[in-house]
């Protein structure tokens, strides 16, 4: 009769994929069809793989996802012409561990971070065989890096300065497939090297060829000599210039620039070590030509006494204001009303106090340091009768 061999009475498995093996001897050797595995719920499984030697048949079963409810008595069954044999064995399915809390950052420098991995409490089953700390820079398409950890407190070295990182912990329990899901993520940012950038940076156009950069006075915390480094580059062209400004100054005039061009400027405070760059500031030099007409002009929401006019303007022409000029159709040119909008970021205005049942001619133009744009076309506006008032 066949005999089932090498099958322990108790097996502990981790949830996930599981490939149990049933091994049997006897003559004739059991075939693939003669070996089955019965789950605790009575489900009969057939081998996914099968091989034999001169003395043994080996049936390999596949359970794609074994879960704790599958725990219990499983039965390996062999049924040949020589007879039938069954061997029960106990399977205990364990839940993979996962930390409940994100790791805590105790301290950071410009290239290191001290972390409490907070591996306990965790969800799932122990015992924990090993722990991994996973980390990677945010905003980089890099794979997660990891280090094996034995203590709760660990130092991460060789980090990039002023970089945001993500951290999480992965716990591993004994047995095959014991790697749990990573726990909650913590973000932190490494410190910068050197002094912080100047505060209160402001960049304004001064003329067609100059921009003025100003900042608050710098009071160094040490006796070291320091200076302000200003970098300016053109958006349209690729030229770049770095200027060194004595540390006691609070402004610099950037000159020899081109009219109607956008520049990006940043600054830092350097000692022997280079400081941290400021955020980019952008500004346009003043225009050398008249501004173009406002575009996308739209008159809508017309009532008996009002109408909404909206528009867009092009960047880079140093437009300081928008004027809406309107007059009753057929009246003299000098009988117009001008509405001057001094905030060029405003792109909509409600004309109010119009007369009912009146035809108006509306012009809109932009002003800059050179002059006013030239409207090629007027817009018509006919107010509604009062009976149409909402």
């Amino acid at each position: 009769t066949p005999k089932i061999v090498d099958l322990p009475d108790h097996i502990e498995v981790n949830s996930g994929k599981f490939n149990p093996i049933c091994k049997a001897s006897g003559w004739p050797l059991p075939t693939n069809e003669e070996m089955t595995l019965v789950k605790p719920d009575g489900t009969v499984l057939h081998p996914k793989d099968f091989n034999h030697t001169d003395h043994f048949s080996v049936a390999i079963f596949t359970i794609h996802r074994i879960l704790p409810p599958d725990s219990g008595v499983w039965v390996c069954s062999v049924n040949t012409v020589a007879g039938m044999v069954e061997k029960p064995f106990n399977i205990s399915v364990k839940v993979l561990p996962k930390p409940l809390n994100a790791p805590n950052v105790i301290d950071t420098g410009h290239n290191f971070a001290v972390i409490n991995i907070s591996s306990e409490p965790y969800f799932g089953d122990g015992p924990i065989k090993s722990k991994k700390l996973l980390y990677k820079p945010v905003n980089h398409y890099e794979a997660w890096q990891h280090i094996q950890v034995t203590n709760e407190i660990v130092t991460l070295n060789y980090l990039e300065p002023r970089t945001e990182y993500e951290l999480c912990v992965q716990l591993v329990r004994r047995g095959e497939g014991g790697e749990g899901h990573p726990g909650p993520v913590r973000r932190f940012t490494t410190a910068s090297i050197g002094l912080p950038p100047p505060r209160g940076l402001n960049l304004l156009p001064k003329s067609q060829t100059t921009l003025n950069l100003t900042w608050q006075p710098i009071f160094p915390s040490s006796e070291d000599d320091f200076y302000v480094e200003v970098e300016r580059r053109s958006v349209q062209k690729s030229d770049q210039q770095n200027i060194k400004v004595p540390g006691n100054l609070t402004s610099v005039l950037l000159n020899n620039l081109h009219p109607r061009e956008q520049y990006v400027v940043r600054a830092r405070v350097n000692t022997k070590a280079q400081g941290e760059w400021s955020e980019d500031l952008t500004a346009w030099t003043l225009s050398d030509i008249l501004p173009p007409q406002p575009e996308n002009i739209k008159i809508s929401n017309i009532t008996h006494s009002s109408a909404v006019i909206s528009w867009t303007i092009l960047d880079g022409y140093s437009i300081s204001s928008i004027t809406i000029r309107y007059k009753v159709q057929g009246k003299n040119e000098d009988q117009h009303v001008d509405v001057k909008i001094k905030n060029a970021t405003i792109t909509q205005y409600q004309l109010k106090g119009l007369e009912p049942e009146t035809a108006y001619q509306v012009d809109i133009f932009a002003e800059n340091n050179i002059g006013s744009s030239n409207p090629a076309f007027s817009h018509e506006l006919v107010t509604l009768p009062e009976s149409q008032a909402p």
Partner: antibody, heavy 115, light 107 residues
Framework: QVQLQQPGAELVRPGASVKLSCKAS????????MNWVKQRPGQGLEWIGM????????RLNQKFKDKATLTVDKSSSTAYMQLSSPTSEDSAVYYC????????WGQGTTLTVSS | DIQMTQSPSSLSASLGERVSLTCRAS??????LNWLQQEPDGTIKRLIY???SLDSGVPKRFTGSRSGSDYSLTISSLESEDFVDYYC?????????FGGGTKLEIK
């Protein structure tokens, strides 16, 4: 000078949707509404709807809400009207007209729906 | 929808004669009315907008006026090119609506 160019004629099979065009020149296309108007043979004019090219805001005559779709292509300063599932009732001349107050008109496209 | 009733639907007149075409609005439309001219080849041109404002390039013989809910287009002295179709159009309330048209024929 302001010009609205429309193809002279279009022939379409019943049920096959058709897209009529109106190419604008001589003014700032995105600063004026564009209207579409229908005229059946020997009949009067009927307003279909209008679109503002700056943001594609559209106002449609309810009668044409399931028939006409108005769009624009700012890069080519062209307004379009697509007519879905045309029937012989849609055979007509279709005009585009500039502005809220219809100050300039295209020459019209004669649409024939025939198998 | 606002109804625009245009009359007469056709009119025979002689060169040099003075004629008036009328549109009546079913609701108050204020001055929100245009007069359009359509030639036999289909070409449409705006003559008058906002009831009485003459478009540039339009001869002075064309005038627009209003009396209550009646709107008139008057041609003071007919010339040969005036014998075409005319439509009124209101744009006070959507949907914009046209009059039925007047065919001006030479007598």
């Amino acid at each position: 000078q302001v010009q609205l160019q429309q193809p002279g004629a279009e022939l379409v099979r019943p049920g096959a949707s058709v897209k009529l065009s109106c190419k604008a020149s001589g003014y700032s296309f995105t600063s004026y509404w564009m209207n579409w108007v229908k005229q059946r043979p020997g009949q009067g004019l009927e307003w279909i709807g209008m679109i503002h090219p700056s943001d594609s805001e559209t106002r449609l005559n309810q009668k044409f809400k399931d028939k006409a779709t108005l769009t624009v292509d700012k890069s080519s300063s062209t307004a379009y009207m697509q007519l879905s599932s045309p029937t012989s009732e849609d055979s007509a001349v279709y005009y585009c007209a500039r502005g809220y107050y219809f100050d300039y008109w295209g020459q019209g496209t004669t649409l024939t729906v025939s198998s | 929808d606002i109804q625009m009733t245009q009359s007469p639907s056709s009119l025979s007149a002689s060169l040099g004669e003075r004629v008036s075409l009328t549109c009546r609005a079913s609701q108050d439309i204020g001055i929100s009315l245009n007069w359009l001219q359509q030639e036999p080849d289909g070409t449409i041109k705006r003559l008058i907008y906002a009831t009485s404002s003459l478009d540039s390039g339009v001869p002075k013989r064309f005038t627009g006026s209003r009396s209550g809910s009646d709107y008139s287009l008057t041609i003071s002295s007919l010339e040969s090119e005036d014998f075409v179709d005319y439509y009124c159009l209101q744009y006070v309330s959507s949907p914009w609506t046209f009059g039925g048209g007047t065919k001006l024929e030479i007598k």
